[in-house]
């Protein structure tokens, strides 16, 4: 008996071939001997089966001795043995129809679980293997689960159902709702304008929800809500904003926040959360602000940084075009009685400069100039 695998919702074509290459009488029946379709001369006739409105044949092939049964919009319950009667012969074809669906929405938040459920006909014992867009393979029976979805899991999942040494392939598009980056860090000199951007890793025509930026300043004992906003069809509107700092927010995506100036009291870490309509859970992105200040007070030239810096970052003070006078893995460095000239304060990571502030030290009879 020939076995054919079909996909729920698809169309299948079951073949039936006569030895004579001409149009002769044929009938297709199901296992209950109920006629599905056949011919009367050059006319297609249909029987009283449940497939009536979904069954068809290809009249153009009859003259070649081919009498296919075409079943459209396949259902799991179409799984059956189909019998083609032609030239006093019976050809049996076993059709097994499978369906694979995501048990929830195909748009899932980062960190959520994806469950794929296989619908299969009674008596079948299929195995399923799915390959994620990042090449990860998962195997299972009737259900497959992937916990803690990551951004790289966004895309087309290819699942192969194996039964009787035959296979059928399903493709399911999964969208993981997340920000492009889990975390970002901004380095600024004191007084500079600060911009934070929160690009999303997905695109949808309509995007509605609400969000908030909570900020934990390094100098503060508790976190504070800096801004709350609404998102309606990708359009941003501010609901509430603190007076200090007075953040500005762009009206379009990507979410864009501007802090008029970087000040030591703002240095710290923020957490932007975005709750999307009809979704449980929230999207998160961490943002960090590091602020640098170079000052000269009397005979002391000081460079300080505030905010979340890693212990491997190096803070240095050097006179332009000269070797560093002081270089430490600390958040403040200073030079006593600095020579006159343009001094540079550098925050660097393995030799790569992240932040630089220049300060001009004048001969001792003058006051310092900040360029």
């Amino acid at each position: 008996k020939k076995v054919v695998l079909g996909k729920k919702g698809d169309t299948v074509e079951l073949t039936c071939t006569a030895s004579q290459k001409k149009s002769i009488q044929f009938h297709w029946k199901n296992s209950n001997q109920i006629k599905i379709l056949g011919n009367q001369g050059s006319f297609l006739t249909k029987g009283p089966s449940k497939l009536n409105d979904r069954a068809d044949s290809r009249r153009s092939l009859w003259d070649q001795g081919n009498f296919p049964l075409i079943i459209k919009n396949l259902k799991i319950e179409d799984s059956d043995t189909y019998i083609c009667e032609v030239e006093d012969q019976k050809e049996e074809v076993q059709l097994l129809v499978f369906g694979l669906t995501a048990n929830s929405d195909t748009h899932l938040l980062q960190g959520q679980s994806l469950t794929l459920t296989l619908e299969s006909p009674p008596g079948s014992s299929p195995s399923v293997q799915c390959r994620s867009p990042r090449g990860k393979n998962i195997q299972g029976g009737k259900t497959l689960s992937v916990s803690q979805l990551e951004l790289q899991d966004s895309g087309t999942w290819t699942c192969t159902v194996l039964q009787n040494q035959k296979k059928v392939e399903f493709k399911i598009d999964i969208v993981v709702l997340a920000f492009q980056k889990a975390s970002s860090i901004v380095y600024k000199k004191e007084g500079e304008q600060v911009e934070f951007s929160f690009p999303l890793a997905f695109t949808v025509e309509k995007l509605t929800g609400s969000g908030e930026l909570w900020w934990q300043a390094e100098r503060a004992s508790s976190s504070k809500s800096w801004i709350t906003f609404d998102l309606k069809n990708k359009e941003v509107s501010v609901k509430r904003v603190t007076q200090d700092p007075k953040l500005q927010m762009g009206k379009k995506l990507p979410l864009h926040l501007t802090l008029p100036q970087a000040l030591p009291q703002y240095a710290g870490s923020g957490n932007l959360t975005l709750a999307l309509e009809a979704k449980t859970g929230k999207l998160h992105q961490e943002v960090n602000l590091v602020v640098m200040r170079a000052t000269q007070l009397q005979k002391n030239l000081t460079c300080e940084v505030w905010g979340p810096t890693s212990p491997k970052l190096m803070l240095s003070l050097k006179l332009e075009n000269k070797e560093a006078k002081v270089s430490k893995r600390e958040k403040a460095v200073w030079v006593l009685n600095p020579e006159a000239g343009m001094w540079q304060c550098l925050l660097s990571d393995s030799g790569q400069v992240l932040l630089e502030s220049n300060i001009k030290v004048l001969p001792t009879w003058s006051t310092p100039v900040q360029p």
Epitope: V186, E192, Q193, V194, E195, S197, E205, K206, N233, K234, E235, Q248, M249, G250, K251, K252, L253, P254, H256, T258
Partner: antibody, heavy 120, light 107 residues
Amino acid sequence: EVKLVESGGDLVKPGGSLKLSCAASGFTFSSYGMSWVRQTPDKGLEWVATISSGGSYTYYPDNVKGRFTISRDNAKNTLYLQMSSLKSEDTAMYYCARHEDGNWNYFDYWGQGTTLTVSS
Amino acid sequence: ETTVTQSPASLSVAIGEKVTIRCITSTDIDDDMNWYQQKPGEPPKFFISEGNTLRPGVPSRFSSSGYGTDFVFTIENMLSEDVADYYCLQSDTLPLTFGSGTKLEIK
């Protein structure tokens, strides 16, 4: 009064480079996203590049990505467009335009434009 | 990318008549359509912004309507000073895209 004045347009050979400038006045330059838009008789108006108010974020259409670089100097109230690997299809009138937003949205003010001709 | 199809390409209208220009977008852009007027040798001038909002200083004979994918720009009583090119711009999503323009002339 918002004023945007473009300069730097020239005749350049294919494959060549050029930098356009736009001097802004009459508004707080550092509070607005800025863009370059070009116009040709056959292609009409075409968005070329956008930069956010502080200059940290830039956006480009695919046809100029990697060839054009938008930048700004908020201390000088000036917007720039550095163009390289120029093609004949880059020939156009280039306008500097302001967004009514710190990042991007529509264009509310335009400069008078400067002409770039790419020809051998 | 959202494509914007503008029609007609040119229009000849008698003074005092009504002018209608249409822009259709390939995706739903809510009400994020804008309209510009451009006279020869000048840069485009902002006439109508998102949400069919008339810009300050623009005469009230100009208006627009539409939502989603279909947008219409109207001049109620054509005047000789309205002779110009008119462009629509979608500002829903990047890349920002313009209509191909409509040349408005006097009949």
